[in-house]
Amino acid sequence: KKVVLGKKGDTVELTCTASQKKSIQFHWKNSNQIKILGNQGSFLTKGPSKLNDRADSRRSLWDQGNFPLIIKNLKIEDSDTYICEVEDQKEEVQLLVFGLTANSDTHLLQGQSLTLTLESPPGSSPSVQCRSPRGKNIQGGKTLSVSQLELQDSGTWTCTVLQNQKKVEFKIDIVVLAFQKASSIVYKKEGEQVEFSFPLAFTVEKLTGSGELWWQAERASSSKSWITFDLKNKEVSVKRVTQDPKLQMGKKLPLHLTLPQALPQYAGSGNLTLALEAKTGKLHQEVNLVVMRATQLQKNLTCEVWGPTSPKLMLSLKLENKEAKVSKREKAVWVLNPEAGMWQCLLSDSGQVLLESNIKVLPTWSTPVQP
């Protein structure tokens, strides 16, 4: 008996060939001997089967002795043995229809689980293997689960169903809803304007939801909400903003926030959460702000940084075009009785300057100038 695998919703063509290359009488029946279709001369006739409106044949092939049964919009329950009667012969074809669907939606939040469920006919024992867009293979039976979806899991998942040495391939497009970056860090001199951007890693026609930026300043004992907002069809509207700092928010995507000036009291880390309509759970992006200040008080030149810096970062004070006078893996450095000239405060990581602030030290009889 010939075995043919089909996909739910697809069209399948079951072949039936006579030895004579001409149009002769044929019938297709199911395992209950109920006629599906056949011919009467050059006319197609249909029987009382459930397939009535979905069954067809190709009249153009009859003259060549080919009498296919075409079943459109396949259903799992179409799985059956189909019998073609032609020239006093019976050709049997076993059709097995499979369906593979994602648990709920194919748009899932980062960190959520993807469950793929195989619908299969009774009595079948298929195996399934799926390959993710990043080349990860998962195997299973009726269900396959992938926990903690990552951004790289976005794309086409290719799943192969194996039964009776035959295989059928399914392609499922999965969109992982996430921010492009899980975390970002902004380095600013005191007084500079700060721009925070939160680009999304996906595009959808209509994006609706709401969000909040919750901030933990390094100097503060508790965290607080800096801004809350709504998103309607990609248009951003601010709901509530804290009075200090007075953040501004862009009206279009990508989500964009502006802090008028970087101040030590704002240095710290924030968490932007975004809830999307019809999705349970939220997207998160961490953002960090590091603020630098260089000051001269009497005979002491000081450079300080506030915010989440890594212990390997180096803070240095140097006179322009000279070697660093002081360089430490600390958040504050100073030079006593600095000589006159343009001093640079540098925050660097393995030699790469992340932040720089210049301060002009005048001869001792005058006051310092901050450029």
Epitope: G209, S225, R240, A275
Partner: antibody
């Protein structure tokens, strides 16, 4: 530790006035919006009014508009509710709550003060 | 004003049971929804904010879901201290409004 303590409740005749106070401690009071919520005996919760950090924005439910006024004194870490033209249906426990939770949630509540309007 | 309708108004269950309370808003409120627990003679306590985020210190048996108009509070494996009243509240449009409450009773 965040603490909110209401006071000023009591028995008042219909048409009378009362001023409720809420003393806040354990957090930077001037950083938060604050709310009043009430609960009639055996009934559910009803949000009454709220006020922003510096008192420049105030919102209230229609049933108390023109009769109740919310205010705050950040120097004293205090929230107030001035209630005039009181009615029998205003009888309730009044809670002061901090809008300090994420997503505008009311994360800390006082123990409540009972206001009884009866002749 | 936005009407918040909770159902059921009361539910009987046993320790260890799973209980689901639903809250429906008369118009879309995105995820501006909180769930509170209130024990007799006590002030309400925040359980869930932003429709699905668990407030710090709240046991993980409590969970929230939904967005738009339909929301759910689920208590997995009810504990004796969970038999009390629960309220949903929207913070999308003034005036903030609460659901009428759901009482979880011992069967």
């Amino acid at each position: 530790e965040v603490q909110l303590v209401e006071s000023g409740g009591g028995l008042v005749q219909p048409g009378g006035s009362l001023r409720l106070s809420c003393a806040a401690s354990g957090f930077t009071f001037s950083d938060y919006w604050m709310s009043w919520v009430r609960q009639a005996p055996g009934k559910g919760l009803e949000w009454v009014a709220n006020i922003n950090q510096d008192g420049s924005e105030k919102y209230s439910v229609d049933s108390v508009k023109g009769r109740f006024t919310i205010s705050r004194d950040n120097a004293k870490n205090s929230l107030y509710l001035q209630m005039n033209s009181l009615r029998a249906e205003d009888t309730a426990i009044f809670y002061c709550a901090r809008e300090g939770g994420q997503w505008l949630a009311l994360d800390y509540w006082g123990q409540g003060t009972l206001v009884t309007v009866s002749s | 004003d936005i009407q918040m309708t909770q159902s059921p108004s009361s539910v009987s269950a046993s320790v260890g049971d799973r209980v689901t309370i639903t809250c429906r808003a008369s118009q879309g409120i995105s995820s501006w929804l909180a769930w509170y627990q209130q024990k007799p003679g006590k002030a309400p306590k925040l359980l869930i904010y932003g429709a699905s985020s668990l407030q710090s210190g709240v046991p993980s048996r409590f969970s929230g879901s939904g967005s738009g108009t339909d929301f759910t509070l689920t208590i997995n494996s009810l504990q004796p201290e969970d038999f009390t009243t629960y309220y949903c509240q929207q913070a999308n449009i003034f005036p903030w409004t609460f659901g009428q409450g759901t009482k979880v009773e011992i069967k």
